[in-house]
C-alpha cells in the first residue's frame, strides 16, 4: 500500500493543500485513496511512513512575522484532528521572494478510515512547479 | 533491495552529482547498482522509496539570482528523462557562504533497468564533508 | 520493527537530544527501545531506514559564525561512535531568532545492540512545540 500525489494550485482560501493524481504519481491500489483532492485515506490499520514536501516562496517584508509552517495532520474516525509533524522556516529577505523547501516524514499508526492531510500557513506562497511539492505514504 | 551512497567531489563540470560506495554505505545486493558513479539502477520492477540529501554552501552576491535547486530525476529504458522531485533554497547572505541542507524523498514505480540520479544547479557549492550529502533507495 | 519518538526539552548541557514516548509516538515492539531518553537501540541485525527532524530557532548575531548542525550518529557494541548523516543550516538574521527545519534520513545496516542518536551544536535552540522535532526508524 503506497501513494504519492502531486500538489495542485487552488483558488480555495483553505490552509489545507490540494493534491492530484497527475504527473508521476503513485496509487498502488484501492486500500489508499485521495479524497476530495485533499487527504489520503487508508482502509487498513497499521504502521505507515507518511511524508510531505513543500516548497514555498516568501518575503519577510511582505509576510507576517510568524514563520511559514507546514503541518502533517491526522483525522481518525470519531477523533479530533491532530498534528503529527510540523516544520517551520522563517521568511527570506530575498526579493520578490525567496524559495525554501521543507520535508516532513515519520512512522505512525493509522486506523481503518484514517485520513492524513497537509496544512500550511499561507497556501498562496506554495510552489507548484514540477516536483516541488508532494505528499505520500507507504505501509510498513 | 536497498542502497545508500555517499557524495564524491568531482572535477567534472556536469550538474549530475557523483557518488561512491565508501564510508557507511549500503548496497544490499546486485539488484541495485551504482553506475558510472552517478546513478542508481534497479533490475526489478516495483515501488521504491527514493531519497536524496544535499548540503550546499552559497552566497547571494556570488551566485546567480536563481535559487539553488536539487532535482531527483528518472531515466527509464527507451523513455525521456523526467523530474521526480525538486527542492529549492534561496542563497544565503552569510559570508563567505551560508550552508543549507535539502532533503528529497518519495515513492515511485520503477521499471527494470530504470536509473535515478541527482542534478543540482551548481555542483561546486555542494558540501562533501562526512554525512552531508547522500542518496539512496529502498524497495517496498 | 518501527519507532517514532518525540523531542523533550532537557536541562542537561549535552549536545545529544533527548526524546520521549509521548504524544503520537510509535514503539512497535520490544525489538526497538528508547534508552536513557537519548538513543534508539535495536535487537535485530538488518537494514533500517533511520530519520530525524529538528526544528530550531537561532539568530546570526547571537550565535557562533558556524552553522547549526544536526548529526545522526551510530554506536555499535565495541565500536567507536560514527556519524551517519549531518545537515547544516546557517543561522537566520531574523530577530529575536529565525526558525528553520532540518530533515535527515537514510538506509543503514545496524548490528544487534546498535544504538542511534541525534547530536546538535546547540540544544538550547531546538524547538519542542508539537511535531517540530522527532526521531525514528523502521526495519526494511
Amino acid at each position: 500500500i503506497a501513494a504519492h500525489v502531486i500538489s495542485e494550485a487552488s483558488s480555495k482560501t483553505t490552509s489545507v493543500l490540494q493534491w492530484a493524481e497527475k504527473g508521476y504519481y503513485t496509487m498502488s491500489n484501492n486500500l489508499v485513496t485521495l479524497e476530495n483532492g485533499k487527504q489520503l485515506t487508508v482502509k487498513r490499520q497499521g504502521l505507515y511512513y507518511i511524508y510531505a514536501q513543500v516548497t514555498f516562496c516568501s518575503n519577510r517584508e511582505a509576510s507576517s512575522q510568524a514563520p511559514f509552517i507546514a503541518s502533517l495532520c491526522l483525522k481518525s474516525p470519531g477523533r479530533f484532528e491532530r498534528i503529527l509533524l510540523r516544520a517551520a522556516n522563517t521568511h527570506s529577505s530575498a526579493k520578490p521572494c525567496g524559495q525554501q523547501s521543507i520535508h516532513l516524514g515519520g512512522v505512525f499508526e493509522l486506523q481503518p478510515g484514517a485520513s492524513v492531510f497537509v496544512n500550511v500557513t499561507d497556501p498562496s506562497q506554495v510552489s507548484h512547479g514540477t516536483g516541488f511539492t508532494s505528499f505520500g505514504l507507504l505501509k510498513l | 533491495i536497498a542502497a545508500h551512497v555517499i557524495s564524491e567531489a568531482s572535477s567534472k563540470t556536469t550538474s549530475v552529482l557523483q557518488w561512491a560506495e565508501k564510508g557507511y554505505y549500503t548496497m544490499s545486493n546486485n539488484l541495485v547498482t551504482l553506475e558510472n558513479g552517478k546513478q542508481l539502477t534497479v533490475k526489478r520492477q516495483g515501488l521504491y522509496y527514493i531519497y536524496a540529501q544535499v548540503t550546499f554552501c552559497s552566497n547571494r552576491e556570488a551566485s546567480s539570482q536563481a535559487p539553488f535547486i536539487a532535482s531527483l530525476c528518472l531515466k527509464s529504458p527507451g523513455r525521456f528523462e523526467r523530474i521526480l522531485l525538486r527542492a529549492a533554497n534561496t542563497h544565503s547572505s552569510a559570508k563567505p557562504c551560508g550552508q543549507q541542507s535539502i532533503h528529497l524523498g518519495g515513492v515511485f514505480e520503477l521499471q527494470p533497468g530504470a536509473s535515478v540520479f541527482v542534478n543540482v544547479t551548481d555542483p561546486s557549492q555542494v558540501s562533501h564533508g562526512t554525512g552531508f550529502t547522500s542518496f539512496g533507495l529502498l524497495k517496498l | 520493527i518501527a519507532a517514532h519518538v518525540i523531542s523533550e526539552a532537557s536541562s542537561k548541557t549535552t549536545s545529544v537530544l533527548q526524546w520521549a514516548e509521548k504524544g503520537y509516538y510509535t514503539m512497535s515492539n520490544n525489538l526497538v527501545t528508547l534508552e536513557n531518553g537519548k538513543q534508539l537501540t535495536v535487537k535485530r541485525q538488518g537494514l533500517y531506514y533511520i530519520y530525524a527532524q529538528v526544528t530550531f530557532c537561532s539568530n546570526r548575531e547571537a550565535s557562533s559564525q558556524a552553522p547549526f548542525i544536526a548529526s545522526l550518529c551510530l554506536k555499535s557494541p565495541g565500536r567507536f561512535e560514527r556519524i551517519l548523516l549531518r545537515a547544516a543550516n546557517t543561522h537566520s538574521s531574523a530577530k529575536p531568532c529565525g526558525q528553520q527545519s532540518i530533515h535527515l534520513g537514510g538506509v543503514f545496516e545496524l548490528q544487534p545492540g546498535a544504538s542511534v542518536f541525534v547530536n546538535v551544536t546547540d540544544p538550547s535552540q531546538v524547538s519542542h512545540g508539537t511535531g517540530f522535532t522527532s526521531f525514528g526508524l523502521l526495519k526494511l
Partner: nanobody
Framework: EVQLLESGGGLVQPGGSLRLSCAAS????????MSWVRQAPGKGLEWVSW????????YYADSVKGRFTISRDNSKNTLYLQMNSLRAEDTAVYYC??????????WGQGTLVTVSS
C-alpha cells in the same frame, strides 16, 4: 594537489606531552571534517580522533579520551592534536586524514611518536 604534512612527533617520557600539527593544502580546508589516526609498530590503523569543519563537534577513541584534544585553525589550514599523559601504548606513527576513517581519501606521511623512559 592535496597535501597533508604532519609534524611535532618525537621521543617523550611516559606522562609527558606533545602537540602534533598537520598543515593542509590543495583543498578547501574549512569544507572538510578531519581525523587523526595512528599505526603502532606491527599493528593496523587505529582511529584516534575526529573534528568537524568548524571545530564544534569532536569524537575520541576510548583509549585517548580525556588525554588527547583535537583542534583546528581554519585561518591557518592546520589541524592539531594535543597529547597529554602519554603512555607507552601511544607509541605509533600518527597520520592526519581528510574526513572519517572509513572515508579518508587522503592522509599524510605521518609523524612518529615514541613514548619511552
Amino acid at each position: 594537489e592535496v597535501q597533508l604534512l604532519e609534524s611535532g612527533g618525537g621521543l617523550v617520557q611516559p606522562g609527558g606531552s606533545l602537540r602534533l600539527s598537520c598543515a593542509a593544502s590543495g583543498f578547501t580546508f574549512i569544507a572538510y571534517d578531519m581525523s587523526w589516526v595512528r599505526q603502532a609498530p606491527g599493528k593496523g590503523l587505529e582511529w584516534v580522533s575526529w573534528i568537524d569543519e568548524w571545530g564544534l563537534q569532536t569524537y575520541y577513541a576510548d583509549s585517548v579520551k580525556g588525554r588527547f584534544t583535537i583542534s583546528r585553525d581554519n585561518s591557518k589550514n592546520t589541524l592539531y592534536l594535543q597529547m597529554n599523559s602519554l603512555r607507552a601504548e601511544d607509541t605509533a606513527v600518527y597520520y592526519c586524514a581528510k574526513k572519517t576513517p572509513e572515508e579518508f581519501d587522503y592522509w599524510g606521511q605521518g609523524t612518529l611518536v615514541t613514548v619511552s623512559s
